[in-house]
């Protein structure tokens, strides 16, 4: 690597992946092995983060980024960056400090995380049950009893492809 | 970058109704449930309900059941919250929260908050 | 339905620690977040899950719950954390809001 020339601050030739050695007369040194710097001028390089137990690599550390982590089956992610791996649940259960629980009858939940929500109420919004609710599903509505004129029929829509619920990053 | 961006300040007189919007950009729209809630001058943050914006479903306060209605157009990833039959006490900013992804239903963005006054 | 309670203010000097506690009926069983709302400014999520901080929020915040009481702790408080502070909890069928903290930094 060439010694930087820049007139204002030699540190900022440094390209990602390198650091500014202070103990080398300010030479861009590369990031030493497990470590890594995303953007240039760098004085120091970053630690890789490692994903280690219930974390796994979904992305190995490259001298300009860090390492992704994802979770192991049966685990999924919550925070920025997967910060965290938290418990799976099955649908129609949630997750509380003492594990999974089942949903209380007129709650539901959809996914494997999350909590038991109740029962959407459909009279609230001006329509009608189309399809009753169970601990997996929440109620589909449908058009208020009074836009049903005789003989016309209600077709049950197609469920969402997914609910909310929140995919890893 | 996640944002939510409300619609602007209201005036409305008392027995009116009042729509506010918040369209959402920087994330999956239909990934995340979408809530409302309010805050009176002076006063602490109430929850008035929520919206499920891939089927439309909603779960709304007691407090506001029968006066608010959560709505959604995901073309436009924008949810809707309207209430009817205003009141004074109703003025109040109101502000559209998304919810996170923490055990136990935590509220991680807000959009910037419309303020709704109500006066005669 | 479900209450949290928090004392209405709180005054620490610069540079020490300040507690805000959430009390509610064996609140230790729920998740309890926390929410720092500056004056004309949306509230911010700054501890979720009882302990843990989005990114962005300075390690000075913590939070701990057990028993009935939650505590957001705020180490070494600077001028800047001088706002109001809002624990929430989920309870069955509502998002339930404590009634809110000013902290004064003096």
């Known amino acids: 690597f060439e010694r930087t020339r820049s007139l204002q601050d030699p540190c900022s030739n440094c390209p990602a992946g390198t650091f500014c050695d202070n103990n080398r007369n300010q030479i861009c040194s590369p990031c030493p092995p497990n470590s890594f710097s995303s953007a240039g001028g760098q004085r120091t390089c970053d630690i890789c983060r490692q994903c280690k137990g219930v974390f796994r690599t979904r992305k190995e550390c490259s001298s300009t980024s860090n390492a992704e982590c994802d979770c192991t089956p049966g685990f999924h992610c919550l925070g920025a960056g997967c910060s965290m791996c938290e418990q799976d649940c099955k649908q129609g259960q949630e997750l509380t400090k003492k594990g999974c629980k089942d949903c209380c009858f007129g709650t539901f939940n959809d996914q494997k995380r999350g909590i038991c929500r109740p029962w959407t109420n459909c009279s609230l919004d001006g329509k009608s049950v189309l399809v009753n609710g169970t601990k997996e599903r929440d109620v589909v509505c449908g058009p208020s009893p009074a836009d049903l004129s005789p003989g016309a029929s209600s077709v049950t829509p197609p469920a969402p492809a997914r609910e909310p619920g929140h995919s890893p990053q | 970058q996640m944002q939510l961006v409300q619609s602007g300040a209201e005036v409305k007189k008392p027995g009116a109704s009042v729509k506010v919007s918040c369209k959402a950009s920087g994330y999956r729209f239909g990934g995340y449930y979408m809530h409302w809630v309010r805050q009176a001058p002076g006063q602490g943050l109430e929850w008035m309900g929520w919206i499920n914006p891939n089927s439309g479903g909603t779960n709304y306060a007691q407090k506001f059941q029968g006066r608010v209605t959560i709505t959604r157009d995901t073309s436009a990833s924008t949810a809707y919250m309207e209430l009817s039959s205003l009141r004074s006490e109703d003025t109040a900013v109101y502000y559209c929260a998304r919810e996170g992804e923490a055990v136990g239903l935590d509220l991680d963005y807000w959009g910037q908050g419309t303020l709704v006054t109500v006066s005669s | 339905s479900y209450e949290l309670t928090q004392p209405p203010s709180v005054s620490v000097a610069p540079g020490k620690t300040a507690r805000i506690t959430c009390g509610g009926n064996n609140i230790g069983s729920k998740s309890v977040h926390w929410y720092q709302q500056k004056p004309g400014q949306a509230p911010v999520l700054v501890i979720y899950?009882?302990?843990d901080r989005p990114s962005g929020i300075p390690e000075r915040f913590s939070g701990s719950n057990s028993g009935n009481t939650a505590t957001l702790t705020i180490s070494r408080v600077e001028a800047g954390d001088e706002a109001d502070y809002y624990c929430q909890v989920w309870d069955s069928s509502s998002v339930v809001f404590g009634g809110g903290t000013q902290l004064t930094v003096l």
């Open positions: 899950y009882d302990s």
